[in-house]
């Protein structure tokens, strides 16, 4: 996606001081999707637009962060700003769809990540490096911390895989890319098996 962060920042910076305060208050009460945590009130109220943008992206990822920002802006009656985010969302969707076309055959045969789940749980040792690569783009802050809280590499990988069912192809590709960088020989071995 990528553009969402800039679009959110533009929207928040285009709010007056009072509107930004109101946005934060609404963010504290807005209905969240299951599995997502709330940004702590104390920290939230002190944030400027740029900090809040980064926090929205790290807590909710770009796609849901964008959606959440749109929801709150609409709730505040700020249709113009919400519409601009909607345009960004649609543009990003089109880009993502175009980018995923070549990978359709992969989807039919099953992604590497799904095919080698058991082996990855058993054999990945540098889990923290993988997590750092996925933090903020694939994993929310809460998910990242939840995986890190596990004690063994296997338990960390099991926890990581518990989030995979909700991932799209781009997320799985990101995990594969991280594994290629951190465990190149393991990936090579599994690809040949």
């Amino acid at each position: 996606m990528g553009r969402a962060r800039d679009a959110i920042l533009d929207a928040l910076e285009n709010l007056s001081g009072d509107e930004l305060k109101k946005f934060k208050m609404k963010l504290l009460t807005v209905q969240l999707r299951e599995g997502y945590g709330r940004i702590p009130r104390g920290a939230l109220l002190q944030m400027d637009a740029i900090d809040l943008t980064d926090k929205l992206v790290s807590y909710y990822l770009e796609s849901y962060g964008l959606e959440l920002t749109m929801t709150v802006l609409r709730d505040m009656g700020l249709q113009e700003l919400a519409e601009q985010l909607q345009t960004t969302k649609e543009e990003s969707g089109a880009v993502a769809a175009a980018a995923s076309v070549p990978a359709q055959s992969t989807a039919r045969t099953g992604h590497f990540v799904d095919q080698h789940r058991q082996a990855l749980i058993a054999r990945v040792t540098e889990v923290d490096g993988v997590l750092d690569a996925l933090h903020g783009s694939v994993l929310t802050e809460g998910q990242y911390q939840a995986v890190r809280a596990e004690t063994t590499s296997q338990d960390k990988m099991r926890k990581l895989f518990s989030f995979v069912p909700s991932w799209n192809l781009t997320c799985k590709d990101s995990l594969l890319q991280a594994l290629k960088e951190i465990h190149p020989y393991l990936v090579m071995d599994l690809e040949q098996s």
Partner: antibody
Framework: QVQLQQSGVELARPGASVKLSCKAS????????ITWVKQRTGQGLEWIGV????????YYDEKFKGKATLTADKSSSTAYIELRSLTSEDSAVYFC?????WGQGTTLTVSS | QIVLTQSPAIMSASPGEKVTITCSAS?????MYWFQQKPGTSPKFWIY???NLASGVPARFSGSGSGTSYSLTISRMEAEDAATYYC?????????FGSGTKLEIK
Amino acid sequence: QVQLQQSGVELARPGASVKLSCKASGSTFTSYSITWVKQRTGQGLEWIGVIYPRSDNTYYDEKFKGKATLTADKSSSTAYIELRSLTSEDSAVYFCATRDYWGQGTTLTVSS
Amino acid sequence: QIVLTQSPAIMSASPGEKVTITCSASSSVSYMYWFQQKPGTSPKFWIYSTSNLASGVPARFSGSGSGTSYSLTISRMEAEDAATYYCQQRSNYPFTFGSGTKLEIK
């Protein structure tokens, strides 16, 4: 898609002030940001500052505080940069840009 | 303010050669942006949020990095890639640019 149309070549005397314009079309002016960038001949890009037209929030590079003032006229979807106390150091191409799109640039020449 | 240092300042590459331009930040940034500029024209938005190619950018370009170290790579240099490339951070005001890397074709 946003289009940005900048004013033409500007000639100014040392010590004078000048106001360059950047007219936006193709998207809601008050929903995004307008950034101004300076480029002297053969040199790199210098970030002057950014304005968010709906809120009039502005941020400047320290170097340009007191030299440049960014404003926006919502009714005409036009952003402006005013440069004051001009010297030959201000002779450059000035670009306006949104997140993804750039204007064609305005060449400012300061000469007596 | 965050200072971005690009290297090399000038480089030349033969057609088909792999090219890597680096951008080092004086403190950690969330993402990096890259622009391409050819003489007498406005800069073009090239890579956004570290690794996403802007519309119309050839797939031989890629971006990567995190923290204070970022790079733009061209897998196989082509004549049309000769230009000056600038990195930019948008993590903290002011949104500074790197000093630029002029890429020439051999």
